[in-house]
Amino acid sequence: DSEEDEEHTIITDTELPPLKLMHSFCAFKADDGPCKAIMKRFFFNIFTRQCEEFIYGGCEGNQNRFESLEECKKMCTRDNANRIIKTTLQQEKPDFCFLEEDPGICRGYITRYFYNNQTKQCERFKYGGCLGNMNNFETLEECKNICEDGPNGFQVDNYGTQLNAVNNSLTPQSTKVPSLFEFHGPSWCLTPADRGLCRANENRFYYNSVIGKCRPFKYSGCGGNENNFTSKQECLRACKKGFIQRISKGGLIKTKRKRKKQRVKIAYEEIFVKNM
């Protein structure tokens, strides 16, 4: 009765301290404030470990609010110049690096790259173009950056265990948010629910990017933002499956986003969000 998957034994041998933030306010929730402006801002999401977009109302709120993605990254993720160290026992790779290659069920035969945990190297494979899993990269470089160790145990990329000069302790850090974790679906899926300015109480759904689920909310009947769907299925389709289904002043506009533009993100969702 094995206590864990054999191939992960080494990795789970050592407990890793959690992410240490440069500023404690980076852990604050996105706070749109009580005002009603529609201002695009960015916040650091402690649970996704990345900077994400939200709509700010224009007043109050908190310090976890940045004018640009770059400013957010600068304040809340580590500088690339920091040296990153990885050892066999103290490593923090994304879990998906350990998933087996998965071409999916479609027949596109696109060249992609995956991390082979047996050979400890990134290798080419043929991806069908849909489903599959997150161990799926457009370039060899991206795969190496995220999943491979560099020479002498040095991690070449963004995820790793950083030697803290102050107390010589090992702390996993995210030095930058790689492109893999940028949400390539509709950007409004990352905005908070906004009931708008009118007085109706219509049942709508919005995509909650913190928990990765579609949730109900009451819509006032006017204003608000595009993270607003008349059914849960519409919400899931738009924000999980790469279909754009938005509500605008002119009513429903239904367009289809080509899977190509979704890149690996579709696969990511399929693996990580199954039970809504």
Epitope: L19, F47, T48, E92, I211, N275
Partner: antibody
């Protein structure tokens, strides 16, 4: 339906060891991080440990660090908690719980939406 | 890091409004969650993301969170609401933290 069932609790002497198991069903176990939460008799809830979805990252409360080991076998849909060097203050009902998803990442979400019924661990001589 | 403090007990007459507080340094900047636990049972989530109710939770349960206090409000309290209530949030590293719990007695 979504279900978590703990087992392995019982009476153990101080300094002894015990391994708890949690069998998951009704959802794709390998897609979720998992946690252990405990509750001493008549006391409040205390978060104990979390393990990421594939099992490559583990974190512990200071009170159990170095003594407890969380692990998982995704092929068996089972979560484990190996408890060594047990103390009287480890006496508690141990709950296995599923945190929500953290958007599109391998981390855990900010709260638990599914809980097991708990298994009692008594550390006494 | 964040410590969450709850009153050990709160009493309320049936049909009245019960308010259970959860104080923590700047908790309003983090999301608060509330669980209900009845004797011999596992906790059940009643409020998530400060003020949202999971499906199946009665409308009389509501939540708010600002400054240093998160509050669970039960309006029109019923006998079946008698239980222990726990607030939960997270620290600046994303690890989960619970309050000490409040025993709600319906008189």
């Amino acid at each position: 339906q979504v279900q978590l069932v703990e087992s392995g609790g019982g009476l153990v002497q101080p300094g002894g060891s015990l391994r708890l198991s949690c069998a998951a069903s009704g959802f794709t176990f390998s897609n979720y991080a998992m946690t252990w939460v405990r509750q001493a008799p008549g006391k409040g809830l205390e978060w104990v440990s979390v393990i990421s979805s594939v099992g490559s990252n583990t974190y512990y409360a200071d009170s159990v660090k170095g003594r407890f080991t969380i692990s998982r076998d995704n092929s068996k849909n089972t979560l484990y908690l190996q408890m060594n060097s047990l103390r009287a203050e480890d006496t508690a009902v141990y709950y296995c719980a599923r945190p929500t998803k953290a958007g599109r990442t391998w981390w855990w979400g900010p709260y638990m939406d599914v809980w097991g019924q708990g298994t009692l661990v008594t550390v006494s001589s | 890091d964040i410590e969450l403090t709850q009153p050990p007990s709160v009493s309320v007459a049936p049909g009245q409004t019960a308010r259970i507080s959860c104080s923590g340094d700047n908790i309003g900047s983090y999301y608060a969650y509330w669980y209900q636990q009845k004797p011999g049972q596992a906790p059940v989530l009643v409020i998530y993301d400060d003020s949202n109710r999971p499906s199946g939770i009665p409308e009389r349960f509501s939540g708010s969170n600002s400054g240093n206090t998160a509050t669970l409000t039960i309006s029109g309290t019923q006998a079946e609401d008698e239980a222990d209530y726990y607030c939960q949030s997270y620290d600046s590293t994303g690890l989960l933290v619970f309050g000490g719990g409040t025993k709600l007695t319906v008189l």
